[in-house]
Amino acid sequence: KDSEIFTVNGILGESVTFPVNIQEPRQVKIIAWTSKTSVAYVTPGDSETAPVVTVTHRNYYERIHALGPNYNLVISDLRMEDAGDYKADINTQADPYTTTKRYNLQIYRRLGKPKITQSLMASVNSTCNVTLTCSVEKEEKNVTYNWSPLGEEGNVLQIFQTPEDQELTYTCTAQNPVSNNSDSISARQLCADIAMGFRTHHTG
């Protein structure tokens, strides 16, 4: 019986686990893993904690192992080219004899500290209009940005700063499916540059 596709998120250079979740390991004969090509096959090992893995593609040599008793497969030292669709054909002693589990591996970089860029738009009656832009160093896929304490989403935040807001700290959190990181700027800094005539300010 074919299953739906299970999305697995991995971090570049780290390890990822494909959850096979075998509940009756005594009934497993062999599990064949394929992606763009054959990847590996996994067979029962005499140690119930570690099934035997035979890697069938050189790209995966010394990077794959399986965990007992559930036969979960681990790929370590992840590379961007590891991303894609994977399939585990599970051959058992019992009818229906073969079941298939499907996975999609997405690989992301662990996010570094984002940078907040400040642009002073205008200043009227001790209220200044400031735009804050938050960005991560490398352009990454699936990155979302959130600002606290305002709860705004997106990487750009427009602020009308009044003297009463001096004690606030604005924090930008960048997040992708595998990590998050934050940077902050205090409200005190935002309009302090007006007197000095600066239009932009970089934190960090």
């Epitope: 019986k1 299953s3 979740n21 509940q23 009756e24 390991p25 005594r26 009934q27 004969k29 067979t43 029962p44 090992g45 005499d46 119930e48 008793p69 058992t92 002693q93 019992a94 079941t99």
Partner: antibody, heavy 117, light 112 residues
Framework: QIQLVQSGPELKKPGETVKISCKAS????????MHWVKQAPGKGLKWMGW????????TYADDFKGRFAFSLETSASTAYLQINNLNNDDTATYFC??????????WGAGTTVTVSS | DVLMTQTPLSLPVSLGDQASISCRSS???????????LEWYLQKPGQSPKLLIY???NRFSGVPDRFSGSGSGTDFTLKISRVEAEDLGVYYC?????????FGGGTKLEIK
């Protein structure tokens, strides 16, 4: 502690259907498979098969293919055994049994099904 | 299917005696992973079975050390070194190496 609580005894007529329940507690239900074992009066034990509690995929021993169905209500941590078109040979006590990968570690108290016209 | 044959069918013993139950499989029950999934269960009167021994010789947690299992291939034995009143009931061997998994016919341990 881990418990499997089964539903009460059933008296049925030939041709009818029975559905017995097995409610699990004390562990994460979807981690371990649930098996069913039959014991006819004064007889030994017979393994009927099992259900994967994560996927709902059943596996039946050959003698229990056709009229027998294993199912789950995961939200209630409950496994079910349904027997259709009952006949006299189905008169037995049915046990649900939790597997711990390499052995059966917990058994329900059993549900007695009597088929009589 | 693997047939599990237990002997004797009935075993009358005196309390404090040693008891020995034999279980023979119709074919080797060594699993493809090299382990032998032979278990022993005790069903006391009016109760459900309980696990005593797994993988031929491993005592399950809480099982007294007077119970021991041995054997290999197709021949297996359960020994009770000093029978106590609470040991009475029906003992079943079971193989979980080859599907369908099968139980022995049972051995009734009773007071002589």
């Amino acid at each position: 502690q881990i418990q499997l609580v089964q539903s009460g005894p059933e008296l049925k007529k030939p041709g009818e259907t029975v559905k017995i329940s097995c409610k699990a507690s004390g562990y994460t239900f979807t981690t371990y498979s649930m098996h069913w074992v039959k014991q006819a009066p004064g007889k030994g034990l017979k393994w009927m098969g099992w259900i994967d509690t994560a996927t709902g995929e059943p596996t039946y021993a050959d003698d229990f293919k056709g009229r027998f169905a294993f199912s789950l209500e995961t939200s209630a941590s409950t496994a079910y055994l349904q027997i259709n078109n009952l006949n006299n040979d189905d008169t037995a006590t049915y046990f649900c049994v939790k597997s711990a990968y390499w052995y059966f570690d917990v058994w329900g108290a059993g549900t007695t099904v009597t088929v009589s016209s | 299917d693997v047939l599990m044959t237990q002997t004797p069918l009935s075993l009358p013993v005196s309390l404090g005696d040693q008891a020995s139950i034999s279980c023979r499989s119709s074919q080797s029950i060594v699993h493809i992973n090299g382990n032998t999934y032979l278990e022993w269960y005790l069903q006391k009167p009016g109760q459900s079975p309980k696990l005593l021994i797994y993988k031929v010789s491993n005592r399950f947690s809480g099982v007294p050390d007077r119970f021991s299992g041995s054997g290999s291939g197709t021949d297996f034995t359960l020994k009770i070194s000093r029978v106590e009143a609470e040991d009475l009931g029906v003992y079943y061997c079971f193989q979980g190496s080859h599907v369908p998994w099968t139980f022995g016919g049972g051995t009734k341990l009773e007071i002589k």
